[in-house]
């Protein structure tokens, strides 16, 4: 389109812009490391750094991990966004006694007003219940309507706190105690993983969930405990860790209480198709180190296409370890030096030569 030529020329004269033929206009060139928020950015504000999933861009322009709400006394208030952290708060029926950045370090159950006291302000995620003396004529056994109701999903049955004189404090705090923990969990109807055949009410038979350990007195740091080889995901469910049991995989990071095991292809291989926390398809690394390649004498030096041999075989060459030393052995198997995190060698069979051609066939 000749009418577009002046615009294209204008772009070419400006190093901070480029011409996008698809949209036929000048676009702002995002600086190195910044990600355009639209196809044709127009100004610097249309560019931003791209963070990995579960990270956000903080005010200092750093990718920072979003907090996790995986403790069973927390729920997600706002999700992890590109420019803001996930925000956690205490689950219904609890309040935060020790705050933390974007979360709460310690949640306690809302107090139930003792006999002779009524609720002045109901508990919230941030504040405990505030009690006040009951008006005359109200039955002490039923000092407030809340104390006479059956507990619902938002309230937790528990012993009443020791009465506190209104002169010293108008509110009481009930620490989470081990003795009532399972009852409290059952009453709060915590969600379980969909593949779990049992409910929290029967924790001893739940395959993904272990009976929760009693909490230290006054501690809110009690979490749902998953069975071995399960982790607590962000939705608070016990989820199976991925397995690295395939022959071509090795464990990169172990299964932890709040994160899956991660797997990667064994040394000498490369991931051809990824999967969550793992690699769906590993192939032998298809290009030999330059100084060790074995090839027919009549083969062209450049523009050689190397085809990956079948899975489980290696190219017909001795890959040079990163430290430059020769492999420990070459027959009948090759020893490839594992990367710098591990100082062991891994025998890899060499049952098939690599197909070499200059045509890519």
């Amino acid at each position: 389109f000749p009418q577009d030529r002046p615009f294209e020329d204008t772009c070419h004269g400006n190093p901070s812009h480029y011409y996008d033929k698809a949209v036929r206009r000048c676009c702002y060139r995002c600086p190195m490391g910044l990600f355009p928020t639209q196809q044709c950015p127009q100004r610097p504000t249309d560019c931003r750094k791209q963070c990995e999933p579960d990270y956000y861009l903080d005010e200092a322009d750093r990718c920072t991990a979003c907090v996790t709400c995986s403790r069973d006394d927390l729920v997600e208030k706002t999700p992890c966004a590109w420019n803001s952290s996930r925000v956690c708060e205490c689950r219904p029926g609890m309040f935060c006694s020790t705050s933390a950045v974007n979360s709460c370090a310690r949640c306690f159950f809302h107090s139930v007003c003792p006999a002779g006291m009524i609720v002045k302000f109901p508990g919230t995620a941030q504040k405990n219940t505030v009690c006040e003396p009951a008006s005359p004529g109200v039955s002490p056994a039923c000092a407030s309507p809340e104390n006479c109701k059956e507990p619902s999903s938002g309230t937790i049955p528990q012993a009443k706190p020791t009465p506190v004189s209104p002169a010293t404090s108008s509110a009481s705090t009930m620490p989470v105690r081990g003795g009532t923990r399972l009852a409290q969990e059952a009453a709060s109807k915590l969600t379980r993983a969909p593949d779990s055949p049992s409910s929290v009410g029967r924790p001893s038979s739940d395959p993904g969930l272990s009976p929760t350990q009693p909490c230290p007195e006054g501690s809110g740091d009690c979490r749902k405990q998953c069975e071995p080889d399960y982790y607590l995901d962000e939705a608070g469910r016990c989820t199976a860790c991925v397995s690295c049991s395939r022959d071509d995989l090795v464990e990169k990071t172990p299964c932890a209480w709040n994160s899956s095991r991660t797997c990667e292809c064994r040394p000498g291989m490369i991931c051809a198709t990824s999967a969550t926390n793992s690699c769906a398809r590993c192939v032998p690394y298809p290009i030999c180190a330059a100084e060790t390649v074995t090839k027919p004498q009549d083969m062209a030096e450049k523009d050689t296409t190397f085809e990956a041999p079948p899975l489980g075989t290696q190219p017909d060459c001795n890959p040079t370890p990163e430290n430059g030393e020769a492999p420990a052995s070459t027959s009948p198997t090759q020893s490839l030096l594992v990367d710098s995190q591990a100082s062991k060698t891994l025998p890899i069979p060499t049952s098939a030569p690599v197909a070499l051609s200059s045509t890519g066939k």
């Epitope: 990667e264 040394p267 991931c271 690699c279 690394y285 290009i287 030096e301 450049k302 890959p319």
Partner: nanobody
């Protein structure tokens, strides 16, 4: 931290061509192998092609005969010439540094650069 900048993506009709570039000035370019990976919406990160420092190449079966990888060590740039494009080539394309060492896990998309979007549609 090494930054790679991919460019050259855009909207193209089936059968069309695009040339992607990946530039960096953060390392001695003539040392490591370089690779192109791609990630289609809702799919995993997929290896497309690798080029060694001395010009030897590898291509995934799905792109063989249509894509050509090359590099200009003097310009610290690696290229991916994509011909006979198909709708299934639609993805964000990423270049990766030293895939022998860095791409054993499923994390070679968006590891260094922001990628460049290639859309093949009529």
């Amino acid at each position: 931290e090494v930054q790679l900048v991919e460019s050259g993506g855009g909207l193209v009709q089936p059968g069309g061509s695009l040339r992607l570039s990946c530039a960096t000035s953060a390392f001695t370019f003539d040392g490591p192998d370089m690779a192109w990976y791609r990630q289609a919406p809702g799919k995993g990160c997929e290896l497309v092609s690798i080029i060694s420092a001395d010009g030897r190449t590898y291509y995934a079966d799905s792109v063989k005969g249509r894509f050509t990888i090359s590099r200009d060590n003097a310009k610290n740039t690696v290229y991916l010439q994509m011909n006979s494009l198909r709708p299934e080539d639609t993805a964000v394309y990423y270049c990766a540094l030293d895939p022998r060492k860095n791409c054993r896990g499923g994390y070679c998309c968006a590891n260094w650069g922001q990628g460049t979007l290639v859309t093949v549609s009529s």
